[in-house]
Interface confidence: low
């Protein structure tokens, strides 16, 4: 059955209520001089608009703080009204390696994520770090990696382990939950020239999440004792017809192309799911396409095999699948499916379909794909044109979040955390925010309030308090680092 | 194919230094760490350390602490291994190993060997 | 240290019979699913060959009569026809923490 009735229960103790952001945007100084400065001056308002030091005085000082970054001050005030756990946001490589290389650090960008992070757990919020965010915009690479075909480059893989193992060094001690790679299964939307482009890339983002996975395994797990996967765009397929085989087929082949194209390598074989391969071949043999996915060799099945510690997930919507023979050699062709919009489903501006009941068989389909492990929702959410009262956000999130508990109570899945997608909206953006872009606070927030504080949906008698130690203690010694570590 | 090719036999006289090589040919020498393991006759397999030429970190094992030495060379794909204020029991085989991406930290790759013999 | 300990030291065997040689760990080499203890084959005057990674992996081009087995501290390998080519001497090596170390060794030799 699709729908089923709404279930009371509780999320377990050390469940992570988080709330995701995409890129944060490293402030380049901090916005208080005037605390480093020992200097007076005086703004020349009507003349030449500069400031003029006024000789003779002296002001007292103090050392730079993290809150001197105004925008740290804004994203603090804003989880401290979500009441969230933890925060999973993504650096900007491009601002952190300017160059791609360790040549040239940006230390002032790598001190404001430390002050994030720091900032983050003396309010007892944890941070997800995810280390690469590409949007479709913008593909969030340093310019020199860029201009080197990007990855279609295998060296930008090599350079990327470079900038991980360089994050692991510098925030791996108050950061336990990181995200190598944000959605590299949607690259396909900018690495579509061709089939081929499209499975070049993401075999080398698949090696580079595995390069970093390793370094980390090797070099920082030992004494940073925390949890390294990648973040897959993990929508649910459903057939337009259920009554139809070629639509159900689809909709697996759908999940095999999306998900299990980089699932299956990391979580299970080591190489691409046999379906997906089969299936471009056979396409291939017709004349209908000239894509191949890419042969790996045994070091590099080795390389890539088993290189999660947890299954990060972000979750939107479902999509309704039909079969439909395509030709030609992109991997959107090399699929052979349409989707169809139901216009009887409850949507969003932008037509994302409300399916809560899709996110539990996802869940469902991982488990028994790649067994059982962990599970995080690294980012689902819903864009609501409200700007105060976001009604569709609230049922989305009530109702998704009822699924994610069947699917812990009634079908046993390790599911240890949901991020709701997101904390800001962006202007000129759908809206997918808690908080509109000028930061103001929308209703949805007092909802979610209500479920992290009761952890889920209660029995009218049970209790929601957690001792200590069953709460979420990743970092007990990060808050200890935070005082005596410099920042 | 992968080699680590190393230098060749080494007669040094006590308290004197000797350094070996590892020329690594084959794959792509910043991304997988080189060990180095010592071999003498009628005796096991010592593990001495390990570099990692992607970023020069090294670790040692204790008792080669002040003994040897690990550097490495990106340009040229070459390892380097230095044994200082040498002594008859440091007369042994010298093996480079390459470890295979570094997950299992097991050793597939392995140089020839390189004789290192202290005497007066 | 983590300290291997092989035996026998020395094994004659018959060619066509099963050689089994043990290697016990002081302390468990196993974690995060993984347990990192290795096998390895020298031969005088050349260098050793990886036959098992990871306990029980068998290295790509290695004949499939040699398995390893065991997770912890205890860990077998199994050589099974034994041929005239596998005389030599087999070690264990553990990678779970550093220092790495090896066994003292296993002589197998045909009878």
């Known amino acids: 059955k699709e729908s089923t009735p709404d279930v009371q229960g509780q999320f377990p103790c050390d469940f992570s209520w988080g709330v995701t952001e995409s890129v944060l945007k490293p402030e380049s100084v901090a916005s208080s001089p005037q605390f480093s400065d020992p200097h007076l001056y005086v703004w020349n308002a009507t003349g030449n608009r500069l400031l003029h030091r006024v000789e003779g005085v002296r002001l007292k000082t103090r050392p730079a703080q993290c809150t001197d970054f105004v925008n740290i001050k804004k994203q603090l005030e804003m989880l401290a009204r979500m009441k969230v756990t933890h925060y999973r946001f993504a650096l900007d490589w491009a601002s952190v390696l300017p160059t791609g290389n360790l040549s040239a650090v940006n230390r002032q960008a790598l001190r404001y994520y430390r002050c994030v992070v720091s900032e983050g757990l003396k309010l007892g919020i944890s941070a997800m770090v995810t280390l690469y965010y590409p949007t479709h915009a913008h593909l969030g690479l340093p310019e020199p990696l860029l201009h080197a075909d990007g990855w279609l480059n295998p060296s930008t893989a090599e350079a990327f382990q470079a900038y991980a193992g360089l994050c692991f060094q510098e925030l791996g001690d108050l950061v336990k939950l990181w995200i190598t790679i944000n959605e590299p299964n949607r690259l396909s939307d900018i690495y579509n020239r061709s089939g081929n482009d499209t499975y070049g890339a993401a075999h080398n983002l698949l090696v580079a999440h595995a390069l970093a996975w390793r370094l980390y395994d090797r070099q920082f797990r030992p004494s940073q004792r925390g949890a390294v996967s990648l973040s897959l765009h993990a929508d649910w397929a459903e057939p337009a017809n259920p009554y139809a085989d070629s639509h159900w087929r689809a909709a697996e082949r759908f999940l095999q192309f999306e998900i299990a194209w980089f699932a299956e390598p990391l979580f299970k074989t080591g190489d691409y799911p046999a379906a997906m391969r089969e299936y471009i071949a056979s396409k291939h043999r017709r004349g209908l396409s000239s894509s191949a996915l890419p042969r790996l060799t045994e070091a590099e099945r080795r390389l890539l095999k088993g290189t999660v510690d947890f299954c990060a997930l972000n979750h939107f919507t479902t999509r309704f699948v039909m079969h439909e023979q395509l030709a030609g050699s992109r991997y959107d062709s090399d699929r052979d499916i349409q989707f169809l919009q139901d216009i009887t489903r409850l949507s969003s501006p932008t037509r994302l379909a409300v399916i809560p009941w899709g996110v539990r068989k996802l869940l469902r389909w991982v488990r028994r794909n790649y067994g059982d492990m962990d599970i995080y929702i690294t980012a689902s959410g819903i864009d609501d044109q409200a700007l105060e009262d976001d009604r569709l956000r609230k049922y989305y999130l009530g109702k998704y979040l009822q699924e994610v508990l069947k699917a812990y109570l009634i079908d046993k899945v390790r599911i240890k955390g949901y991020y709701a997608f997101k904390l800001a909206e962006e202007k000129s953006k759908p809206r997918f925010g808690f908080f509109t872009s000028d930061f103001k606070a929308k209703s949805s927030i007092q909802f979610y309030n209500k479920v992290i504080s009761s952890r889920g949906f209660p029995f009218e008698n049970s209790s929601s308090r957690c001792s200590q130690t069953q709460e979420n203690t990743e970092c007990t010694v990060c808050l200890f680092l935070v005082q005596k570590k410099p920042l | 194919q992968v080699q680590l090719q190393q230098s060749g036999p080494e007669l040094v006289k006590p308290g004197a230094l000797v350094k070996i090589s590892c020329k690594a040919s084959g794959y792509t020498f910043t991304r997988y760490d080189i060990n180095w393991v010592k071999k003498r006759p009628g005796q096991g397999l010592e593990w001495i350390g390990w570099?990692?030429?992607?970023?020069?970190?090294?670790k040692y094992n204790e008792k080669f602490k002040g003994k040897a030495t690990l550097t490495a060379d990106k340009s040229s794909s070459t390892a380097y291994m230095q044994l200082s204020s040498l002594t008859s029991e440091n007369s042994a085989v010298y093996f480079c190993?390459?470890?295979?991406?570094?997950?299992?930290?097991?050793?597939?790759?392995w140089g020839q060997g390189t004789l290192v013999t202290v005497s007066a | 240290d983590i300290v291997l300990t092989q035996s026998p030291a020395s094994l004659p065997v018959s060619l066509g019979q099963r050689a089994t040689i043990s290697c016990r760990a002081s302390k468990s080499v196993s974690t995060s699913g993984y347990s990192y203890l290795h096998w390895y084959q020298q031969k005088p005057g050349q260098p050793p060959k990886l036959l098992i990674y990871?306990?029980?992996n068998l290295e790509s081009g290695v004949p499939a009569r040699f398995s390893g087995s065991g997770s912890g501290t205890d860990f077998t390998l199994n050589i099974h026809p034994v041929e005239e080519e596998d005389a030599a001497t087999y070690y264990c090596?553990?990678?779970?923490?550093?220092?790495?170390?090896f066994g003292g060794g296993t002589k197998l030799e045909i009878k």
């Open positions: 990871l306990a029980s």
């Open positions: 190993a390459r470890s295979d991406y570094y997950g299992s930290r097991s050793f597939v790759y």
């Open positions: 090596q553990h990678s779970g923490e550093l220092p790495y170390t």
């Open positions: 570099i990692y030429p992607g970023d020069d970190s090294t």
